[in-house]
Interface confidence: low
């Protein structure tokens, strides 16, 4: 039946497309399916172009294999003519509907048997069964061995040659290690094998510019350092340096109308001299804002220094000390005003008293027998000092006071002369401008340190010395030294530092003895708008710590050795630094960047007041911290 159908199709083809010309529709009626028609018709058109009248001669001269149109057209439906299969790889070709099937010889594959089967990559016979090298050849393959191996008799497996046993002195002073097919002359890490001398030599990694900034080479290794004091930290690759980036932006907006009283760690922030008619009396009005509890707001004195008036803060309340030829007085009163809010303060000399008002309410009235400052030659000459007093005054005070005051004043009016002249002085000097908004706390700007002298020796304790530290921190950068104990020989026997964690948006806390990290608290989210509370207790036997996430007593093999180093340093003298390190070598600690952010420190039960420091960088704010910057948005 099938052959009858083929014969019918052949007859139809003869009648429709050879004896007459057929279009594609008529050709489809012959084949009765699209695939064959689509295959046949373009080739039929080629036959027509070759054998139509007038083109016969040209066709015969071409590569056309058919003598006439009939044979050209009759050959079209045979998919195996011309042969589509690869001659090297095919066994047979079978014609199909508008297609063909090539049957391949062993070792070949592909629809046209065009691909040699790579026996070396046969998943059912891995590597062709060869133990080492499998070489594929057309239709076959064979095995071979790498250098340093010999082929076994099965022609598939290889055996290693042990060069170290064959030639024991092959590596000189280095260690010979036989490896499959070869040998290696091994050196310890940080050393390189020298082929000529057959020995191990130290690699000077620093000469190879391994580090971006500072490099320290030592036998068998090297360490890179970055200048933390210039705001750099070591990158994750432990070689390059990157800028210590801000993780919590702060609102550092200032206004020149606000006078910053803590511009200098030691010294007066502003000095004014008044020459007024003798009928003038002393008066000072200003708005005042601070979280500080003690310090000098202003000091006024006569030109000959015989009479003076001190307006200060003690225990958060206004204190007035005065001295002249008639009297010597000290008075404290009113509410606590170190609340971080603006308080209106006025001090006015009346005929028989000095009136002190806060928010226009009288809080103190100090009696005085005569004028505060005595006029001379028809003039009242007065000197006024803001946020301090001349050094010689210190010994004359009725009650000593720490003059340092972290606060701001605005809207001042001295001697009823308004603010004239003062604003102009302040406007030019950025560091005399006060922050617009502040919060309670101490602020380290990442550019300096504060030094304290603290005696850690506890005579009554069996441990001899102990360091109990409580830190309340709100960092603005993720890297910096928060606290360091520094020995006289410029080593750092103990430091607490912050470093950006490898995990995104978190920080690690490092406890270090000299340049060794003895403990790392990993992945804390410290760069947030809330404070984090950390506690450390260290003595010669123990190290305990408490973080928001855990309380832990640390013990590891190396700890006792490190605590012994610390113990030795603590028995000598150590200086305590907050916010960074003094001039010690880069390699003295794992971190050397300044701390940037807010931090309050309690050591051995004493809250450290930065006003009491031996020295402090001017930019560190003892009792105020900038607010977190909130992004402003536009739709």
């Amino acid at each position: 039946a099938n052959s009858l159908l083929e014969e019918t199709k052949q007859g139809n083809l003869e009648r429709e497309c050879i004896e007459e010309l057929c279009n594609k529709e008529e050709a489809r009626e012959v084949f009765e399916n699209d695939p064959e028609t689509d295959y046949f018709y373009p080739k039929y058109l080629v036959c027509l172009r070759s054998f139509q009248t007038g083109l016969f001669t040209a066709a015969r001269q071409s590569t056309n294999a058919y003598p006439d149109l009939r044979s050209c057209v009759n050959a079209i439906p045979d998919q195996c003519s011309p042969l589509p299969c690869n001659e090297d790889g095919y066994m047979s070709c079978k014609d199909g509907k508008a297609s063909f099937t090539c049957t391949c010889k062993p070792g070949w594959q592909g629809e046209k048997c065009e691909f040699d089967i790579n026996e070396c990559k046969d998943p059912s016979n891995i590597n062709g069964g060869c133990s080492q090298i499998c070489d594929n050849t057309p239709g076959s393959y064979h095995c071979s061995c790498k250098n340093g191996f010999v082929m076994l008799s099965n022609k598939k497996d290889c055996k290693d040659v042990d060069e170290c046993s064959l030639k024991p002195s092959i590596c000189g002073t280095a260690v010979c290690k036989n490896i499959p097919g070869d040998f290696e002359c091994e050196c310890p890490e940080g050393y390189r094998y020298n082929l000529k001398s057959k020995s191990c030599e130290d690699i000077d990694e620093c000469s190879e510019n391994m580090c971006a900034q500072l490099c320290v080479n030592y036998p068998g290794g090297y360490t890179c350092y970055c200048d933390g004091k210039k705001g750099f930290k070591l990158a994750q690759d432990q070689k390059s340096c990157e800028v210590v980036s801000v993780c919590l932006p702060l609102n550092l907006d200032t206004k020149y109308e606000l006078l910053y009283l803590a511009e200098q760690f030691a010294g007066v922030v502003l000095y004014l001299k008044f020459r007024l008619p003798e009928i003038s009396r002393f008066s000072a009005e200003f708005d005042f804002r601070t979280y500080d509890s003690e310090g000098v707001i202003l000091y006024a004195e006569s030109i000959d220094h015989s009479a003076w008036l001190l307006i200060a803060l003690r225990g958060g309340k206004i204190e007035v000390q005065l001295k002249n030829e008639h009297t010597s007085k000290i008075t404290t009163g009113g509410d606590v005003i170190n609340n971080g809010l603006w308080n209106m303060v006025s001090v006015e000399e009346l005929e028989h008293s000095i009136s002190i008002k806060i928010a226009k309410e009288a809080v103190m009235d100090i009696n005085k027998p005569g004028p505060l400052f005595k006029p001379e030659n028809g003039l009242l000459e007065t000197k006024v000092y803001f946020a301090g007093f001349p050094r010689k005054v210190e010994s004359e005070l009725i009650k000593p006071i720490n003059p340092r005051l972290d606060g701001c004043i605005r809207s001042w009016n001295l001697m009823k002369q308004g603010a004239s002249g003062i604003k102009e002085i302040i406007q030019e000097k950025q560091n005399k401008h006060c922050l617009v908004t502040v919060e309670k706390g101490s602020y380290y700007p990442g550019s300096g340190i504060a030094q304290f002298h603290i005696d850690y020796n506890n005579v009554s304790s069996a441990e001899g010395w102990h360091v109990n530290v409580t830190l309340n921190i709100r960092p603005s950068t993720g890297t910096g030294v928060m606290l360091a104990l520094v020995s006289g020989n410029n080593t750092v026997p103990f430091a607490v530092s912050l470093v950006d964690s490898t995990s995104e948006k978190s920080q690690d806390i490092l406890l270090s003895v000299e340049n060794t990290v003895i403990y790392r608290i990993q992945a804390l989210s410290l760069c947030s708008d809330q404070q984090s509370h950390l506690e450390f207790r260290v003595n010669r036997n123990n190290l305990e710590l408490s973080t928001p996430l855990k309380i832990e007593t640390i013990s590891h093999e190396d700890l006792q050795r490190q605590l012994a180093v610390l113990d030795k340093a603590m028995k000598a003298k150590v200086a305590t630094y907050l916010g960074g390190l003094p001039d010690v070598p880069f390699s003295a600690t794992p971190v050397n960047a300044f701390y940037n952010g807010c931090m309050e420190v309690n050591i051995n039960g004493v809250q450290l007041d930065l006003d009491e420091a031996i020295s402090k960088h001017n930019d560190i704010r003892a009792h105020s911290c900038p607010s977190v910057w909130k992004k402003t948005k536009n739709s």
Epitope: Q530, K630, N634
Partner: antibody, heavy 119, light 106 residues
């Protein structure tokens, strides 16, 4: 004038989810955080989380972490709060409230959406 | 999280009297915020940043305090002031509210 208009009351079965909407008008939607606060019957106020419509930054109370999702649609000035795996203790009035950042109170509140969880 | 404890839980006073509401934080906060809530209504802000009056709030309301202790004072109670008052802090995540003080007519 500033208005926060919340979607209507919902009754849900335990284990289901609820999605409450809060449509803002009368101000620039992207300039203020939207907070979500709930109040169980006869109880006090409980903060759930907040979203900054400007960049979809979100913070959640630990208690609701994993169960609450805050989203927003800038084009319609609408904030959404979806609470999943509901239980009977989630029966409460849910409020959205506008907040301008540190130093500000939640100055405008939605009228509240009552969500009842009952089998 | 920071716990805010309000006292007293209930305050029974007559119109014209002075009301003093206390809010104590388990650790120091930067500022305190106060809200008034009447039955069936959403809370309404009274005081922001410890001592600033919210828009449209009469001057008889005042706030004070610092650190952990804060106070809301109503100098002379008006009939419309009888309600529940909540303190709230933003100083840590999560922000928290006090349990509330109910001011009722004596």
């Amino acid at each position: 004038q500033v208005q926060l208009v919340q979607s209507g009351a919902e009754v849900k079965k335990p284990g289901a989810s609820v999605k409450v909407s809060c449509k803002a008008s009368g101000y620039t939607f992207t300039s203020y955080w939207i907070n979500w606060v709930r109040q169980a019957p006869g109880q006090g106020l409980e903060w759930m989380g907040r979203i900054d419509p400007y960049d979809s930054e979100t913070h959640y109370a630990q208690k609701f972490q994993g169960r609450v999702t805050l989203t927003r649609d800038k084009s319609t000035s609408t904030a959404y709060m979806e609470l999943s795996s509901l239980r009977s203790e989630d029966t409460a009035v849910y409020y959205c409230a506008r907040w301008g950042g540190s130093g500000y109170a939640m100055d405008y509140w939605g009228q509240g959406t009552t969500v009842t969880v009952s089998s | 999280e920071i716990v805010l404890t309000q006292s007293p839980a209930t305050l029974s006073l007559s119109p014209g009297e002075r009301a003093t509401l206390s809010c104590r934080a388990s650790s120091s906060v930067s500022y305190m915020y106060w809200y008034q809530q009447k039955p069936g209504q959403a809370p309404r802000p009274l005081i922001y940043a410890t001592s600033n009056l919210a828009s449209g709030i009469p001057a008889r309301f005042s706030g004070s305090g610092s650190g952990t202790d804060f106070t809301l004072t109503i100098s002379s109670l008006e009939p419309e002031d009888f309600a529940v008052y909540y303190c709230q802090q933003w100083s840590s995540i999560p922000p928290t509210f006090g349990g509330g003080t109910k001011v009722e007519i004596k």
